[in-house]
Interface confidence: low
């Protein structure tokens, strides 16, 4: 019979014959011959192949490097790669999450407009008049100045974007 020029799904053409691809989780050791089928071996620990393939080497599972702020979100198997995410306080620098950068803290005088997520950084905003932040934080919003009136007190020291107002007792001598 004529040698094939194309093969079925999950096969590949080699030496004028169709050989079976190795299934996910296995790598190619030997091509098939007219006498033997394709020889495949399972991937080792910490290795994977996620498609029907003719690879001679399995891929290493992604390493979620804590030095780069990464941690394991989903452990890899022989058929799937490890999925990394960022440690709390970090966010991915790309969709593939190959490395992380630390969430920025908002300096005193600035509050958190949007808390950082695993994929986006902290968004800071200046504290408007009537609000303050006296800490460097990746979570704290600007706090409103204390309302002295509601406590039956008066403002002794005006607030700033970094400090709260200071309340004190009413001057009782005033009519």
């Amino acid at each position: 019979p004529e040698p094939p020029t194309a093969c079925r799904e999950k096969q590949y053409l080699i030496n004028s014959q169709c050989c079976s691809l190795c299934q996910p989780g296995q790598k190619l050791v030997s091509d098939c011959t007219e006498f033997t089928e394709t020889e495949c071996l399972p991937c080792g620990e910490s290795e994977f192949l996620d498609t029907w393939n003719r690879e001679t080497h399995c891929h290493q599972h992604k390493y979620c490097d804590p030095n780069l702020g990464l941690r394991v979100q989903q452990k890899g198997t022989s058929e799937t790669d490890t999925i990394c995410t960022c440690e709390e306080g970090w966010h991915c620098t790309s969709e593939a999450c190959e490395s992380c950068v630390l969430h920025r803290s908002c300096s005193p005088g600035f509050g958190v407009k949007q808390i950082a997520t695993g994929v986006s950084d902290t968004i800071c905003e200046p504290c408007p008049v009537g609000f303050f932040s006296n800490v460097s934080s990746a979570f704290e919003k600007c706090h409103p100045w204390t309302s002295c009136e509601t406590k039956d007190l008066v403002v002794q020291q005006a607030g700033t974007n970094k400090t709260d107002v200071v309340c004190g007792p009413q001057d009782r001598l005033r009519a």
């Epitope: 030095n67 780069l68 300096s107």
Partner: antibody, heavy 115, light 110 residues
Framework: QVQLVQSGAEVKKPGSSVKVSCKAS????????ISWVRQAPGQGLEWMGM????????SYAQKFQGRVTMTRDTSTSTVYMELSSLRPEDTAVYYC????????WGQGTLVTVSS | QSALTQPPSASGSPGQSVTISCTGT?????????VSWYQQHPGNAPKLIIY???KRPSGIPDRFSASKSGNTASLTVSGLQADDEADYYC??????????FGGGTKLTVL
């Protein structure tokens, strides 16, 4: 436990280059970045840059951009730091260290630049 | 990147506590909780004693503690011992895959 073993001391002429090696053992070579730090005699520590052995990606301190090259050889689990256009003020002990945190250090390599 | 600012020297008697400061900017120390401290004895490589602002690697005694406020990080060595006499360096992540060190502080045990 990761161990980092560096090449021996070097004496170089001004204008020449030096290539320092750092061989890693223990742990998976491709699973951690390597930082390079130098310390001039009687001076403080100075971060020069890093290389991620898994992909070979590098990041260099601005001061050394264009003069430093960090490479790796995965077959021998070794990273290299080459510094060119040497000047007497490059005389220092050069260290490799694991990761940005630098939690494991090599023993250091003294590079002397003198005419 | 400018070096972080540390006092050149600090001292204390055995059993006392001493605190070393490390001042950066809102782009390094103030922006990231990624400050480390290293101890270096003469002729030796530095040794990590604090990372991520306040965490101690296993094997480092709890006499070493650290904190951060704004753009300044601090290392406290309590119950001073003779072997604590060494140079101490801080470092901080500075964004963009870069690190920056402090100038170092020589700690003398009187």
């Amino acid at each position: 436990q990761v161990q980092l073993v560096q090449s021996g001391a070097e004496v170089k002429k001004p204008g020449s280059s030096v290539k320092v090696s750092c061989k890693a053992s223990g742990g998976t070579f491709s699973s951690y970045a390597i930082s390079w730090v130098r310390q001039a005699p009687g001076q403080g520590l100075e971060w020069m840059g890093m290389i991620n052995p898994s992909g070979g990606t590098t990041s260099y301190a601005q001061k050394f951009q264009g003069r430093v090259t960090m490479t790796r050889d995965t077959s021998t689990s070794t990273v290299y730091m080459e510094l060119s256009s040497l000047r007497p003020e490059d005389t220092a002990v050069y260290y490799c260290a694991r990761g940005f945190r630098m939690d494991q250090w090599g023993q250091g390599t003294l590079v002397t630049v003198s005419s | 990147q400018s070096a972080l600012t540390q006092p050149p020297s600090a001292s204390g008697s055995p059993g006392q506590s001493v605190t070393i400061s490390c001042t950066g900017t809102s782009s390094d120390v103030g922006a990231y909780n990624f400050v480390s401290w290293y101890q270096q004895h003469p002729g030796n490589a530095p040794k990590l004693i604090i990372y991520d602002v306040r965490k101690r690697p296993s094997g480092i005694p709890d006499r070493f503690s650290a904190s951060k406020s704004g753009n300044t990080a601090s290392l406290t060595v309590s119950g001073l011992q003779a072997d604590d006499e060494a140079d101490y360096y801080c470092s901080s992540y500075a964004g963009n895959n870069e690190m920056v060190f402090g100038g170092g502080t020589k700690l003398t045990v009187l």
